[in-house]
């Protein structure tokens, strides 16, 4: 595929990545699938600056990111190492709370109203952010 050199329409460029901010809500898995269909992934926060950038755009609204522990340990959807990477959890989080009455614990991470992170039930219909790197090859075939 050809290398993407600029962001698609309605996406925002920042530090060699493109971001798309939803204005509706979906369950985490549906949001994850939406981003994949756009040749992107749910946002992976790797730095203080990226946290601030995303926070600026989403405002004080619960918003999914590409972090989950549905298979045990916390994992970023693009394979970025969780243990050594940037974290911005709210105090006492993640807590895998079972008291919500919806079955199971809390396996998906989202930005809260103050930008810090919380784990929540993956079925909740939150907004989401997609990210794709400008330097990666796009899946579209090159124009002949």
């Amino acid at each position: 595929g050809s290398e993407r050199t600029c962001c698609p329409v309605n996406w925002v460029e920042h530090e060699r990545s493109c971001y798309w901010f939803s204005r509706s809500g979906k369950a985490w898995a549906d949001a994850d699938n939406y981003c994949r269909l756009e040749d992107a992934h749910l946002v992976v926060v790797t730095s203080w600056e990226e946290q601030k950038f995303v926070q600026h755009h989403i405002g004080p609204v619960n918003t999914w990111m590409g972090l989950h522990d549905q298979n045990g340990p916390w994992k970023w959807v693009d394979g970025t190492d969780y243990e050594t990477g940037f974290k911005n959890w709210r105090p006492e989080q993640p807590d895998d709370w079972y008291g919500h009455g919806l079955g199971g614990g809390e396996d998906c991470a989202h930005f809260t109203d103050d930008g810090r992170w919380n784990d929540d039930v993956c079925q909740r219909p939150y907004r989401w952010v997609c990210e794709t790197e400008l330097d990666k090859a796009s899946q579209e075939p090159p124009l002949l």
Partner: antibody, heavy 118, light 107 residues
């Protein structure tokens, strides 16, 4: 009310070490990130380091990287700054400050003076 | 690193005057800009965060504005207790950096 009290400052020779402490009270210490900020005599403010509420992230200004270490003991409500290989240019009043919203200092201690001189 | 440039470095004013201090960032910091007041021998005090939000207890004569790279702190009618040094600070990217300060003195 929120209180931050620094201690451990003093006169030290270049190349030596010093450990500053900041005792916190009046709030849930383990819920807040904490910073060290310094001010050389007659000069402006310079941020030194930050540590997350749970210690999961730490950042430093370049001029102290590899020499200073920020740490905390949430069971003692205390923040620390271990300063090694001190230089004359580290002479300053050192303030601890509470973090609000990733980089905003909403409460400050009264400061402790560190003088590096032979 | 993001450089923060404050102007003026000092100004002499009278009680009741309107005071405007500006701060410019070397790159866009969105609205991640704070203002602090410091009096001699004292720790700084947070006045304004996120460019224009008041810290609780701060008098309404203080106000902040701006976004991107250019920011302003305004004191609508200077009071005797406002004579101090004022600093801007960006929180967008570490290392967190301050402006050089603006000393507000009595004329």
């Amino acid at each position: 009310q929120v209180q931050l009290v620094e201690s451990g400052g003093g006169v030290v020779q270049p190349g030596r070490s010093l450990r500053l402490s900041c005792a916190a009270s009046g709030f849930t210490f383990s819920s807040y990130g904490m910073h060290w900020v310094r001010q050389a005599p007659g000069k402006g403010l310079e941020w030194v380091a930050v540590i997350w509420h749970d210690g999961s992230n730490k950042y430093y200004v370049d001029s102290v990287k590899g020499r200073f270490t920020i740490s905390r003991d949430n069971s003692k409500n205390t923040l620390y700054l271990q300063m090694n290989s001190l230089r004359a240019e580290d002479t300053a009043v050192y303030y601890c400050a509470r973090d609000e919203q990733l980089g905003t200092f909403d409460y400050w201690g009264q400061g402790t003076l560190v003088t590096v001189s032979s | 690193d993001i450089q923060m440039t404050q102007s003026p470095s000092s100004l002499s004013v009278s009680v009741g005057d309107r005071v405007t201090i500006t701060c410019r960032a070397s790159q866009s910091i969105f609205r991640y800009l704070n203002w602090y007041q410091q009096k001699p021998g004292r720790a700084p005090k947070l006045l304004i965060f996120a460019a224009s939000s008041f810290q609780s207890g701060v008098p309404s004569r203080f106000s902040g504005s701006g976004s991107g790279t250019d920011f302003t702190l305004t004191i609508s009618s200077l009071q005797p207790e406002d004579f101090a040094t004022y600093y801007c600070q960006q929180t967008y990217s570490p290392p967190l950096t301050f402006g050089g300060g603006t000393k507000v003195e009595i004329k």
